[in-house]
Interface confidence: medium
Amino acid sequence: MVSPRMSGLLSQTVILALIFLPQTRPAGVFELQIHSFGPGPGPGAPRSPCSARLPCRLFFRVCLKPGLSEEAAESPCALGAALSARGPVYTEQPGAPAPDLPLPDGLLQVPFRDAWPGTFSFIIETWREELGDQIGGPAWSLLARVAGRRRLAAGGPWARDIQRAGAWELRFSYRARCEPPAVGTACTRLCRPRSAPSRCGPGLRPCAPLEDECEAPLVCRAGCSPEHGFCEQPGECRCLEGWTGPLCTVPVSTSSCLSPRGPSSATTGCLVPGPGPCDGNPCANGGSCSETPRSFECTCPRGFYGLRCEVSGVTCADGPCFNGGLCVGGADPDSAYICHCPPGFQGSNCEKRVDRCSLQPCRNGGLCLDLGHALRCRCRAGFAGPRCEHDLDDCAGRACANGGTCVEGGGAHRCSCALGFGGRDCRERADPCAARPCAHGGRCYAHFSGLVCACAPGYMGARCEFPVHPDGASALPAAPPGLRPGDPQRYLLPPALGLLVAAGVAGAALLLVHVRRRGHSQDAGSRLLAGTPEPSVHALPDALNNLRTQEGSGDGPSSSVDWNRPEDVDPQGIYVISAPSIYAREVATPLFPPLHTGRAGQRQHLLFPYPSSILSVK
C-alpha cells in the first residue's frame, strides 16, 4: 500500500479518462467487473478507506499485459489499460459497521487490437480520491494493488476471482470477448454474416477466409482440456503455452519435445517445427522481438506499446505510470513520457515491485523491513541510524554517572565506576557484602577494592572458609570475659606477637594482591567501603568513600548505615586473610589501590587495635 506521502506524486492528468488513440477496429475487448472492495476478513482490517472521516470515493484502474510475468520490468500495459469512473461519494459513519464500499458503475473495458494471447497478466489498482478541503484539489492515494497471471480463452464465460491486498479484499469477474467479425478463442478468425460479401473488408486483419456460419458454435476435440486448450477449427485441440499433449493435459516441462516452434501435433503432442515467430521482426518502431512458446513478445522503446509496438504517442494524459509513479513528459503531446517511480517500484511504467530488502540495505546485520513508505532497519545492539550505519559510540552523552569512566566496544557500553559506585551506569551505591560472602559467622566489611572478612574465632581465610585447626582444637586462648555477644572477639596480644601476626597477615595480603593483579587487571574498580556483617548489618566506624554512617559510641561497628544494593557486583574482590586474633577496626585509607588505577608508590596503612600494631606497607 502506498502511504499518504505518495498521494502528492500522482499527477492530475492521470485521473483523466484513459485516451485510446484512433486505431482500427479492435479484435476484442477484455471486460472487468468489480463486485466489491472492502475490508478483508480477520483482525486488523481497516474500517474505512476514508481517512479522518473526510468524504472520499473510489476508482479503479486495470493494466493488461500478455505473457507469463506480471512483474516484467520493461513490459508496459501492452494489451491495454483502462480507468473506471468515480464511485459514489462515501463518508464514514462513526460506530457503523464497515460496509462494502460504493463502487463505480459499469465495466472496465480494455480493447485489444491483435490476437488475445490466452495467457495474460493483470494489475488492478484501487485508488481513493479524498474530497476534503485540500489546497489544489482532491488528493489521490493508492489503497490497494493486486496482480496476477491467468489463462483465459476469449469467448468463454465470466471468471470470478478474489484477491487480497494487505487488509483489503477485492472481488471481481473478468472475461475476454471478440468484437465482430472476429471469432475464436484468440479472436483471430474472421467471419461475416450470411448476407455479407465474401471478401475482406477494409481494416480486417489478417485477411483470412471469411466463414458464412459465424453463429455456429465452435466445438473443440472431445476431451480437450478446457483450462489449457482451445480451438479455432472444429475438432481441434491447440494448447496454451506451458501445456502440450493431444488434449493439452501434459505440462511442457514433462514433455520430450525439443522444438519450441510451431503448432501442437495432434498425434504426438509435440511442437512441430515451423517458421520462427520473430522471423522478419514483427515489432515496429524499433521494438525488439523475443520468442515465447506459442508466439512472440515485443519489448517496445519508450513511447510505444501494443503487441507489436505499433501504438505510439503515449503521453502523461494516458496515465501510463502505475503505483503512484510521477509522469513527466515534454510539452509536445506526442513526446515520450518518463515515469519517476516511487520507492519500491521500477520499470518503464513503475509496474514492477522491487524487493528492496533483497539488496540487504541494512548495514551491520540490521533487519530490513519494507514499510512501503520507507525502508526501516532494525539495528543490532551497538549500531544505529536509519541504515544501522553508525557504530555506536557507547560512551556518547556521558553514559556513566558519578564520575565513572566509559569503556567502548562490543555494542554495549561498560562503565569503570568511581570508588563507591557500581551498576551498569555507576548510578548505584555498591555493596559487595550484600551476598554475605563471609562464612562461619564472619563479618563482612566492604572496602574500596572489594571486601574484608573479619572471621569468627577458629576460622580464617579470605571468606573465613578455613578452620584454623581442622581437627577443631583451637590453638588460641579463649575469649576474655566481658565481651558482648556479636562483638568481634579481640585478643589482647603482646605487642611483639601482635606485630608478628599483623606482618603475616599483611604479607599474605600482598601476595594475594599480586596474584589478583596479574589475573584480573581488567576489574572495574567499583567496589567500595561498606559493611554487611552476617547476620546483622554493620559498617566500619568511619564514613568512608561517600557512605554515610553514624558513629557508634563504642569501639564496635556502628549499626546505622546508608547504602544501596548493587546491580552487579563481582564477589571476587581483594581479600585480607584475617586471623581470629585481629579485628580490622579501621581502614583509614584504601588497603590497596583499585586495580584499574594501580597507583604506584602510595603508602597504605593497616590500622589495628593498638598503636604499636600499625604497619606501613609499601
Epitope: 499518504p4 506521502r5 481517512s51 510521477l326 519517476h340 516511487p342 514499510l371 520507507a374 526501516r376 536509519p386
Partner: antibody, heavy 123, light 107 residues
C-alpha cells in the same frame, strides 16, 4: 560530516521579497529531499516546503500558509537549497531553518538541521 | 492537516529526575514520528525517529514509545544539558506538522 548552513536573512519591508540559501556539504545532495522550516520568535516550528530528490524529479510540496508566495528550489551543481519569498508579511518574521529529509527510501527525515537565519519583516 | 497536540507546554524538574513528554496525533500516523531537541542557542537536533528509535550519538537516557496515537519521550535521569525545548514531528503525510513544544526548565 553533514553540514547545512543557511544565509540570506535580514530586514525586509512588508510586501518585499527575499531569497534564503542553504549550503549543504558532507553528503550526496541530489540523493535527498530537503525542507525549509521556520520558527517565529517564541513560537513553535512550522514546516514550509519540501523539494524531492533526483530520483523523484525534484518535485515540490508546500504548506498552505505559504503556497503561492514561497518557492523552494535547488542548485544541485552547487549543493544549495533556496527559498524565494515574495509578498512578505510581518507574520513571516522568524528564524528559517533548512533540514535534510528522506532519501526516498530510509528514514533520514529531519536528521540534520542548519543553524538558522533570521528574517525580520517590518516597516 | 494532522494536528500534533503536545503536553505539557512547560515542565520544571530537577537534575536526576525522570520526566516524560507526550504528543497526540489527530489522525493515524503509524510510527512516523520524530522527537527534536532545540537548545537555547537555536540549535536543533533529532533525538528519536520512528517513534522509538534512538539516533546515534544520543544518550541512552532518552527513549521514545508509542501507544496508538499517543507518543512519549522520556528522559530517565535529567542532566544539565537536557534543559531545552522539545518538539514532536509527524512525517506520515504532508504537510509535516510539529507539536507546540515543551519547555523543560531546571527547578
Amino acid at each position: 560530516e553533514v553540514k547545512l548552513v543557511e544565509s540570506g536573512g535580514g530586514l525586509v519591508q512588508p510586501g518585499g521579497s527575499l531569497s534564503l540559501s542553504c549550503a549543504a556539504s558532507g553528503f550526496t545532495f541530489t540523493d535527498y529531499y530537503m525542507n525549509w522550516v521556520r520558527q517565529p520568535p517564541g513560537k513553535a516550528l512550522e514546516w514550509l516546503a519540501l523539494i524531492r530528490n533526483k530520483a523523484n524529479g525534484y518535485t515540490t510540496e508546500y504548506n498552505a500558509s505559504v503556497k503561492g508566495r514561497f518557492t523552494i528550489s535547488r542548485d544541485n551543481s552547487q549543493n544549495i537549497l533556496y527559498l524565494q519569498m515574495n509578498a512578505l508579511r510581518a507574520e513571516d518574521s522568524a528564524t528559517y531553518y533548512c533540514a535534510r529529509d528522506s532519501d526516498g527510501y530510509y528514514e533520514y527525515y529531519f536528521d540534520y538541521w542548519g543553524q538558522g537565519t533570521t528574517l525580520t519583516v517590518s516597516s | 492537516d494532522i494536528q500534533m497536540t503536545q503536553s505539557p507546554s512547560s515542565l520544571s524538574a530537577s537534575l536526576g529526575e525522570r520526566v516524560s513528554l507526550t504528543c497526540r496525533a489527530s489522525q493515524e500516523i503509524s510510527d512516523y514520528l520524530s522527537w527534536l531537541q532545540q537548545k537555547p542557542d537555536g540549535t536543533i537536533k533529532r533525538l528519536i525517529f520512528a517513534a522509538s528509535t534512538l539516533d546515534s550519538g544520543v544518550p541512552k537516557r532518552f527513549s521514545g514509545s508509542r501507544s496508538g496515537s499517543d507518543f512519549s519521550l522520556s528522559i530517565s535521569s535529567l542532566e544539565s544539558e537536557d534543559f531545552a525545548d522539545y518538539y514532536c514531528l509527524q512525517y506520515a503525510s504532508y504537510p509535516y506538522t510539529f507539536g507546540s513544544g515543551t519547555k523543560l526548565e531546571i527547578k
